[in-house]
Interface confidence: low
């Protein structure tokens, strides 16, 4: 059955070389004295991407990242030496790794770095307008970076700068043990989470921070932190990691007598991303790696996309889960986690919850408490001892929307674009991996909008060497994706519709919401452009309905590639054919010489099928004829290649091997009469090369050819060898067999 596609594989897989050759990636390969291009800040208005790296801050042009400005911000020699004396690595640790890069106001950015284990912050002037072209460090104004940037560059930081105040989740000490969520800058006293209390934070790895409004009243605004941490004893048997979402009220100024300069509204809940397994045991993806908030229409209710990996070293897997803010809020309004009972296990708190409910932001909306400093003591006491919620937050549809477990990579980053297509709106995910590839995945609603099918459109290699992707930003204005890693920064378009092919069916099969068939090409789909030829079917990807009558004939350039291959009796030959789409299934047909009838090729000892094509072993005369390679995808059949195989009998070959050039040999003439003079130059030698059964090795064969060549050269001094490089060419061709079918222009394997 040819209908069943290979849905879990990317339809297109593009190597770094293919990406470069097709002008689909622009890379900034880093500076010799820098690395760690991990901290991104996108400024759509100025059309700049600011990137914090080792000892540098860059300002890249969003149109083309090859155009950039840079600020060098290293540490002093004294600081570097102190760091080295403390036993740190001079290259990997004793430098200024930029960890915080945020817009401070209309004219300045705020940046913090590790400062060689001595965190430091400053302001960067960027001017009022893009045309000001200002990008400079405020050298006169450096600030202590403690509680803003970690000391250790290996540690993750999550930060958010709003209304002149910096919220950061980071480590506040040299040893990297005192983790906290801080609020610094601004006019108020710094605030942090309770110190040395594992119930609040237990060795967290911070991922990101986001401001989300609760209501139309700004007093209810909350800052949400996403992180992963060690599960608290009793929460889980054995050492385990839990993914978390934490909340704090923006207007939390700490308590009056207790929790002074500490958060009084901090609450956290577990994020579950799991798939049901056999025997009722779920497979959990607990290692939260990245979060993306899709704000659409209602900023109070963004959809949260989370990238998770497994904790196990044995079972490597990744998943993407989606969460709704209404589910998050429901959990924060649910029971608190409480330790009780003889085993001191975690149970839902059943007692009286003080008023106003801990975690509620002080506002006139609820009970008239203007400030957290006015909260009753019992509220503060309860908040201190009950920071965690009992119920976890489950993903939409109770399962991941993307799962990858059968691959040699793990997910690291995600950005999502909501795309208007002909038949609805689709979320297109760009997922970064730890081997430097980007997956482009579209989630397609099946029966209901939350019952989603994942379609892996493309897998693109964006860096020359495998390197983990550590930062990603998406510009809707430029329709470009920006990717950061230790090695550098890459830029690629969100859509490259032309790569899908030159036929309506190929465009339709791609199921890329960005693309549609416009009557003559696969091109960018704009909902506003009322072009009637636009064909697109994201939901089903069915070309038979949408394209069946749009010609796939020769004058439209869809005729199959035609090749002639010569094989020697009793030897083997390989017919190469691999479709552009990895999701297509290939089947072969054989048509005997002078026969109309085509039969499907059955695999046996004589014929072996591979992903690259068909291997015919021990060739016989009856194998001569036409071999047709067809690709089948979603019921659509496309003929990719027609190979005419000519099998030469051994007797004939002996004749060719030993006949002199001057010799007549009617058989030779008969066999080569279809060839051009330039082809005749080398074809005779070539035919001997194909596993001639009477020659032990290629060396032996080449030796014979060269001897004969020398002999002929002596006999005819005026003869000029027209193909002195032919063996080099042949051997190169023997090497490069794993190629796409659109690269057929090669000699001498295809005459």
């Amino acid at each position: 059955n040819y209908q069943n596609g290979k849905n879990n594989v990317p339809r297109l897989k593009l190597s770094y070389k293919e990406m470069l050759e097709s002008n689909n990636v622009i890379t900034f390969n880093g500076l010799a004295n820098s690395s760690s291009y991990h901290t991104f800040l996108l400024d759509e208005e100025r059309s700049r991407l600011y990137v914090g790296a080792k000892d540098h801050i860059f300002s890249f042009d969003l149109v083309n990242i090859k155009d950039f400005q840079k600020i060098v911000w290293p540490v002093s020699y004294t600081r570097r030496d102190e760091c080295k004396w403390a036993g740190k690595d001079i290259l990997k640790e004793c430098a200024n790794f930029i960890k915080v890069l945020k817009a401070y106001n209309q004219t300045h950015l705020y940046a913090c770095g590790t400062g060689a284990f001595h965190p430091i912050c400053t302001y960067i002037e960027i001017g009022h307008h893009p045309e000001d072209n200002i990008f400079k460090l405020e050298n006169s104004h450096f600030e202590n970076g403690r509680g803003k940037s970690p000391y250790d560059p290996k540690l993750l930081t999550a930060s958010l700068l709003i209304d002149g105040e910096l919220y950061s989740g980071t480590a506040a000490d040299f040893m990297g043990r005192d983790f906290a969520i801080f609020r610094t800058l601004g006019h108020h006293h710094p605030i942090r989470t309770e110190q040395h209390d594992s119930r609040w934070l237990n060795d967290p790895k911070f991922i990101s921070a986001h401001l989300i409004s609760e209501s139309d009243n700004p007093e209810d605004d909350k800052v949400y932190f996403f992180f992963r941490e060690n599960a608290i004893d009793g929460e889980h048997s054995g050492k385990a990691t839990h993914a978390r979402i934490g909340q704090i009220c923006k207007n939390d100024f700490g308590g009056h007598r207790s929790l002074v300069n500490k958060w009084t509204t901090f609450l956290k809940a577990r994020l579950i991303c799991s798939v049901p397994g056999p025997n009722g045991i779920d497979t959990h993806f607990d290692e939260l790696q990245d979060v993306f908030l899709m704000n659409f229409k209602d900023p109070k209710n963004p959809v949260v996309y989370g990238v998770f990996t497994t904790s196990s070293n044995i079972f490597k897997g990744s998943a993407v889960c989606m969460y709704s803010m209404s589910d998050v809020r429901r959990v924060f309004l649910g029971p608190y986690a409480h330790r009780d009972g003889p085993n001191y296990q975690w149970v839902p708190y059943q007692g009286r919850v003080p008023y106003p409910r801990p975690g509620t932001c002080p506002s006139k909306t609820f009970g008239g408490f203007d400030s957290t400093k006015d909260l009753p003591d019992d509220v503060i006491t309860f908040a201190r001892s009950h920071p965690a919620m009992y119920n976890p937050v489950f993903p939409m549809n109770n399962r991941p929307i993307v799962i990858k477990t059968d691959v040699n990579y793990q997910f690291t980053q995600i950005v999502v674009d909501r795309v208007d297509a002909e038949d609805g709106q689709y979320d297109v995910m760009f997922i970064g991996t730890d081997v430097g590839t980007v997956l482009k995945v579209v989630s397609i609603p099946k029966e209901t909008w939350y019952d989603l099918e994942e379609v892996l459109l493309e897998e693109m290699t964006v860096f020359r060497e495998p390197t983990a992707i550590s930062a990603m930003e998406l510009s809707t204005k430029q329709q470009q994706l920006y990717i950061g890693s230790t090695a550098g920064v890459a830029q690629l378009p969100l859509h490259r519709c032309d790569i899908y092919g030159k036929a309506c069916a190929e465009c339709c099969l791609a199921r890329d919401p960005y693309c549609a068939w416009d009557g003559s090409a696969c091109s960018r789909y704009f909902p506003t452009a009322k072009r009637r030829t636009r064909r697109q079917d994201i939901r089903n990807g069915d070309p038979l309905t949408h394209c069946s009558d749009l010609h796939h004939d020769n004058h439209h350039g869809h005729s199959p590639e035609e090749r002639i291959i010569y094989g020697v009796e009793n030897s083997s030959t390989f017919l190469e054919c691999s479709p552009k789409s990895q999701r297509a299934l290939v089947y072969w047909q054989f048509q005997r010489r002078n026969e109309e009838r085509k039969e499907e090729i059955r695999v046996d000892d004589h014929i072996i099928r591979t992903d690259q094509g068909l291997l015919l072993r021990s060739l016989q005369q009856k194998d001569s004829g036409n071999y047709l390679c067809h690709a089948v995808e979603h019921g659509f059949i496309q003929t990719l290649l027609k190979v005419t195989l000519e099998v030469i009998d051994t007797e004939h070959l002996e004749e060719l091997l030993h006949k002199d050039d001057d010799g007549d040999g009617s058989k030779t003439k008969e066999m080569s009469n279809s060839m051009t003079p330039s082809q005749k130059v080398w074809y005779r030698d070539f035919m001997q090369l194909i596993n001639h059964p009477n020659l032990n090795t290629m060396d032996e064969f080449c030796e014979q050819v060269w001897k004969r060549d020398r002999k002929q050269r002596r006999q005819r001094p005026g003869h000029t060898p027209g193909n002195s490089n032919k063996w080099k060419h042949l051997q190169e061709n023997k090497k490069g067999r794993n190629r796409r079918t659109h690269e057929f222009e090669r000699a001498p394997r295809s005459v």
Partner: antibody, heavy 120, light 107 residues
Framework: AVTLDESGGGLQTPGGALSLVCKAS????????MQWVRQAPGKGLEWVAA??????WYGAAVKGRATISRDNGQSTVRLQLNNLRAEDTGTYYC???????????????WGHGTEVIVSS | ALTQPASVSANPGETVKITCSGG????????YGWYQQKAPGSAPVTVI????KRPSNIPSRFSGSLSGSTNTLTITGVRADDEAVYFC?????????FGAGTTLTVL
């Protein structure tokens, strides 16, 4: 078999509004473009409107007055025509495209038609 | 505008050809359809769509062919019940159009 049944025609008053419904059966309507074509008495065929999933197109004579919509669940296509004029009189046919292209070239099935008379 | 002859006539058994030109193109290719209407106000019947496709209920004596930008409807072995008005239809990106119709009279 593919069937298209139009309804909603009849005597209409100038300046009024008209709502025609086409009920489709025998095929999965959501995959195809649907069109409305009309014919004034003694005249030829005139294309009115077309809908393909979400995109819509209208003929010059009805642009700004017509709205075409579809309900794939109910397998219906609706044509709403406002500010009716005497020249809107005729038989209105619902038509299905053989593939998704909005063109008279691709119509492979027609409804029996519903007659509309605009008169005071 | 689509151009087609106003009328054609033929004796039973003869071959009739009706041409239609002036259609719009999709990506450089021209597409036409042919519709038979036996009486004014009665439902048209598609005899050819997409230049040469014939619906399953249409007899094989009806065929369509495209030459350049002109489409030809051919009825081989015309019969009395083929008497009708034949409209051609086409489109491009900006509009969908029908010809004025060709009246086929079977003598």
């Amino acid at each position: 078999a593919v069937t298209l049944d139009e309804s909603g025609g009849g005597l209409q008053t100038p300046g009024g509004a008209l709502s025609l419904v086409c009920k489709a059966s025998g095929f999965t309507m959501s995959s195809y473009e649907m069109q409305w074509v009309r014919q004034a008495p003694g005249k030829g065929l005139e294309w009115v409107a077309a809908i393909y999933t979400r995109s819509t197109w209208y003929g010059a004579a009805v642009k700004g007055r017509a709205t075409i919509s579809r309900d794939n669940g109910q397998s219906t296509v609706r044509l709403q025509l406002n500010n009716l004029r005497a020249e809107d009189t005729g038989t209105y046919y619902c038509a299905k495209s053989g593939i998704g292209l909005n063109s008279a070239a691709f119509i492979d099935a027609w409804g029996h038609g519903t007659e509309v008379i605009v008169s005071s | 505008a689509l151009t087609q002859p106003a009328s054609v006539s033929a004796n039973p058994g003869e071959t009739v050809k009706i041409t239609c030109s002036g259609g719009g193109s999709y990506g450089g290719s021209y597409y036409y359809g042919w519709y038979q209407q036996k009486a004014p106000g009665s439902a048209p019947v598609t005899v050819i769509y997409t230049n040469n496709k014939r619906p399953s209920n249409i007899p094989s004596r009806f065929s369509g062919s495209l030459s350049g930008s002109t489409n030809t409807l051919t009825i081989t072995g015309v019969r009395a019940d083929d008497e009708a008005v034949y409209f051609c239809g086409s489109a491009d990106n900006s509009g969908t159009a029908f010809g004025a119709g060709t009246t086929l009279t079977v003598l």
